[in-house]
């Protein structure tokens, strides 16, 4: 019986990411006896909940239960029944709910209350639903990618487990783009910070990390588009908005009430002599880029260096993983390759945006028109945000790695959140045992 393997004791965890545009459920698993090792937790399933984000259910809270049902039942199928009661379930809501809370704390609480009641009906160990802060979202995203890249591991390897992993232990910065907010998180060269609000200190696996993070609320791709439309309609002479961020020949009617529904457009709100306006695409990257830049206030900076809107940003340092919508958009546009320079990306965006809408619809027949129509804006916005907002350059562009998954696990804040809440990231380096006691008998 010397080499007979015993069945491994596997643990599971569930995290629901209640984003502004949709909710996703992630199931993670790991060997119980290796809880404190780095890199042992991996994602076994992602279930995307059909429908919009939970903040949209504010007037229909009694439908939240059925909205979550399919993905929660999927979790029941994937996780062995014997493990259900000890499987923790966490729900973290991000910027969509932060915006709802700004409008009405009572309504946000009501949505979360119904979410909690719905999730408590399942046989798992429900640990609560809460709105996470922008700082947490940035920090947990940073922890996730560095955990998956093996950056916290003290063991040096002669081989690479993932494409971006060099043998050094320098952490990657994290760039996260959602629908309603965007986060930048990295370890700057200079340990002292001019802005304590943006400083985080971690001790992970025996090493100290001084991390810079900031979350820009209203600068996710969807809210940025609402901001841009609200800004541009101010100067429109009539109810036609000729928009360079949409393909030539594209037309869409927008309700002014929808435009001003979000707190993100409040600064541009004005009384308009019409209830609706029509977007007419003209497909011009350069003009779109100029329009997007007007969303970033770079005229005021109370620090040595700022990103935009007076927010401190230290000099960029090292490699960055760009995930979530950074990846989804750039992947759709076929621009995620390490070999594509920033100049080439800009050139491809110019070409893409200028393509007629009818041509685009034919080329991407399987893609929902609502999403398809916004890739020109989203791609332009990503370039503007990275280059003018965060001050990446043509040279430092090659340090940005557009990442969807790392070793089968999605890049994003959810894994880091679970690792933290289940105490699976020790402050000190665990003592390594030569052989796990339960592996061989």
């Amino acid at each position: 019986t010397q080499n007979k393997a015993l069945p491994e004791n596997i643990k599971y965890g569930i995290v629901l990411d209640a984003g502004s545009s949709h909710t996703s459920l992630y199931i993670y698993k790991w060997p119980a006896e290796k809880e404190n090792d780095t890199g042992v937790v991996h994602q076994v399933e992602e279930c995307r909940v059909k429908g919009p984000g939970i903040s949209k259910y504010v007037q229909k809270v009694n439908e939240i239960g059925i909205y979550l049902t399919d993905c929660m039942e999927r979790a029941r199928e994937v996780i062995p029944r014997s493990q259900h009661q000890e499987t923790p379930v966490y729900l973290g809501a991000t910027a969509g709910m932060r915006l709802l809370r700004m409008e009405s704390e009572e309504l946000a609480d009501r949505v979360l209350d119904v979410v909690e009641r719905s999730l408590s009906n399942y046989p798992f160990d429900f640990q609560g639903a809460r709105i996470i802060t922008g700082q947490e979202e940035g920090a947990y995203g940073w922890i996730t990618i560095n955990y998956l890249l093996g950056k916290f591991s003290q063991k040096t390897r002669w081989f690479s487990i993932v494409p971006y992993e060099t043998n050094n232990q320098e952490t990657f910065g994290a760039l996260d783009l959602g629908g309603a907010s965007t986060q930048i998180t990295f370890v700057p060269q200079n340990q002292t910070t001019e802005s304590p609000d943006n400083a985080l200190q971690f001790r992970l696996y025996g090493k100290d990390y001084n991390v810079y993070t900031h979350s820009f609320l209203c600068y996710g791709k969807d809210q940025a588009l609402w901001q841009k439309l609200a800004k541009d309609i101010q100067v429109a002479s009539n109810e036609i908005l000729r928009d360079p961020c949409f393909h030539p020949g594209y037309k869409k009617v927008v309700n002014v009430s929808d435009l001003y529904k979000t707190p993100c457009t409040k600064r541009f709100e004005m009384t308009l002599p019409f209830q609706q306006f029509e977007i007419q695409g003209i497909g011009n990257y350069q003009q779109c880029h100029q329009s997007v830049l007007e969303l970033f206030n770079t005229s005021y900076c109370p620090y040595s260096q700022c990103a935009f809107n007076g927010i401190f940003l230290p000099p960029l340092q090292g490699d960055f993983g760009a995930f979530s919508a950074f990846y989804f958009v750039m992947n759709f546009l076929n621009l995620t390759s390490e070999k594509v320079s920033q100049e080439k990306v800009t050139e491809m965006m110019k070409k893409f945006c200028s393509q007629p809408w009818e041509e685009i619809k034919t080329s991407y027949a399987g893609v929902k028109e609502k999403y398809l129509s916004e890739y020109c804006f989203s791609g332009t916005y990503i370039l503007s945000l990275l280059l003018q907002g965060y001050h990446f350059t043509a040279d430092s562009w090659e340090h940005i790695h557009f990442i969807g998954k790392i070793q089968g696990s999605d890049a994003g804040w959810t894994l880091g959140y679970m690792l933290n809440l289940t105490n699976m990231i020790p402050a000190e380096q665990p003592l390594s045992t030569p052989l796990s006691h339960s592996t061989y008998v």
Partner: nanobody, 124 residues
């Protein structure tokens, strides 16, 4: 378009059972969710039970353990089995078929179809 036709309502004594049926016809491929709402005089319409395309169900707290929703895809019909009926279950019951929009603008539902309603009265 989707048409929904309810049947099975009526007058019943407390503690007894009723089964409501809702037959769907038309472009039913656009539908992922089906459910039963009810509206008592002077009250808002409330969701009683719902079922997804995968057959997963959800119930209002007030009917849990008493009502069962089911779906027969071959007949394009959804049922509501109502046991241990109480006077407070008295209402007009509406069949609803819908799907959610994935977008953050406009209405929550992309498709939303309703039946005419069937009266359920629980009284001794």
């Amino acid at each position: 378009e989707v048409q929904l036709l309810e049947s099975g309502g009526g007058l019943v004594q407390p503690g007894r059972s009723l089964r409501l049926s809702c037959a769907a016809s038309g472009d039913i491929f656009s539908i992922n969710y089906m459910g039963w709402y009810r509206q008592a005089p002077g009250n808002e319409r409330e969701l009683v039970a719902a079922i997804t395309g995968r057959g997963n169900t959800n119930y209002a707290d007030s009917v849990k353990g008493r009502f069962t929703i089911s779906r027969d895809n071959s007949k394009n019909t959804v049922y509501l089995q109502m046991n241990s009926l109480k006077p407070e279950d008295t209402a007009v019951y509406y069949c609803n078929a819908w799907d959610y929009s994935d977008y953050d603008e406009g209405p929550l539902r992309e498709y939303d179809y309703w039946g005419q309603g069937t009266q359920v009265t629980v009284s001794s």
